[in-house]
Amino acid sequence: VSPTFQVVNSIAPVQECSTQLDIVIVLDGSNSIYPWDSVTAFLNDLLERMDIGPKQTQVGIVQYGENVTHEFNLNKYSSTEEVLVAAKKIVQRGGRQTMTALGIDTARKEAFTEARGARRGVKKVMVIVTDGESHDNHRLKQVIQDCEDENIQRFSIAILGSYNRGNLSTEKFVEEIKSIASEPTEKHFFNVSDELALVTIVKTLGERIFALEA
């Protein structure tokens, strides 16, 4: 802008406003997640806080276990209301395997593509929810590095329910899920005692995600 307040030249901003994020939620859908409606309740509480639309925040959901399913793409729905209806209908796909590296890698390579609605220049956020050590743990380090290289901010949530039900040590599991989270870990990693407690972290998780918009 010139001293006389005339537009000298203009470059269209990459982001129209500061509330743009592309968020992909990566859900563990293996059998040990129980009850599943605790996950859909968590999704509902988190998503209803978001201003979802093609020029605002976009949300996609991926579910994994033994394999990976794109529940819906980033550009599938254009309002919070539509996303809430769709998220409520997500069914647990089951399975005994927890292929977390595969889930994250598929989200990075596929869910965050322009073909599925990702927008150039918009901050990418991944939220990973799981309740067990991955069966493809050997791939995790590289997969996380690939996310890092593509500037994907990662929030990871460890559900301790199946460990507590079986009186098992959570130490190794927690370390693995911490390793998925972006730095600083204490702002990007959450753990909950069981599936029913997922809703207790929604407010803090939401605030931390939206802090990225600033």
Epitope: S30, N31, S32, Y34, P35, W36, G65, E66, V91, Q92, R93, G94, G95, R96, S162, R165, G166, L168, D194, L196
Partner: antibody, heavy 124, light 108 residues
């Protein structure tokens, strides 16, 4: 639509063998546990055992261990309950049901969300 | 194993009335892992409630569950003609599943 379809009613003599089936559809059958439940005439429900069709991992109720065999053929999405030598006391309705939950790592939990229509077995 | 005792054995009520069914466990049911099923004559059981208080898909809101520890309740706020049936509670917190003996809700 999730469905569990069981084989038809059977009339057998004591000492005979029998295998009844439960075929799942409308969901990934290899990814959910299937349980078997007995209901003797005019009585309540008793859990017999459970199988994971994906790898045939099986757990039995202590009351039924050694009395029956639970198996599965994942290629045809079917679970089975079999007896090698039937007794009159095996006369009952047998239900299969899908477990919403898990039975891994020695800990089992979950509810049965979908049920088959039942197979009546009469031994006399 | 956990033994579940249901009471009363039979409940005689009229349509429109409130039904309260009790299920008592011989020891605490972990994580309130208790379900309720309805069974009508010549039909398979149908899931109503799980985790003590969560209604299964498609179950009308006149059915509600409550309780924790050893005492659980199924309430039918206003009985409809199709609600007359046998109701079973089931616990699943101990690596096995046990059922109560059932409560019959019959038309008075």
């Amino acid at each position: 639509e999730v469905q569990l379809v069981q084989s038809g009613a059977e009339v057998k003599k004591p000492g005979e063998s029998l295998r009844i089936s439960c075929k799942g559809s409308g969901y990934s059958v290899t990814s959910y546990w299937i349980g078997w439940v007995r209901q003797m005439p005019g009585k309540g429900l008793e859990w017999m055992g459970i199988i994971y069709p994906g790898d045939s991992d099986t757990r039995y109720s202590p009351s039924f261990q050694g009395q029956v065999t639970i198996s599965a053929d994942k290629s045809i999405s079917t679970a089975y309950l079999q007896w090698s030598s039937l007794k009159a006391s095996d006369t009952a309705m047998y239900y299969c049901a899908r477990l919403q939950g898990d039975c891994s790592g020695g800990t089992c939990y979950g509810h049965f969300d979908y049920w088959g229509q039942g197979t009546l077995v009469t031994v006399s | 194993e956990i033994v579940l005792t249901q009471s009363p054995g039979t409940l005689s009520l009229s349509p429109g009335e409130r039904a309260t069914l009790s299920c008592r466990a011989s020891q605490s049911v972990s994580s309130s892992y208790l379900a309720w099923y309805q069974q009508k004559p010549a039909q398979a059981p149908r899931l109503l409630i799980y985790v003590a208080s969560r209604r299964a898909t498609g179950i009308p809101d006149r059915f509600s569950g409550s309780g924790s520890g050893t005492d659980f309740t199924l309430t039918i706020s206003r009985l409809e003609p199709e609600d007359f049936a046998v109701y079973y509670c089931q616990q699943y917190g101990t690596s096995s599943w046990t059922f109560g003996q059932g409560t019959t809700v019959e038309i008075k």
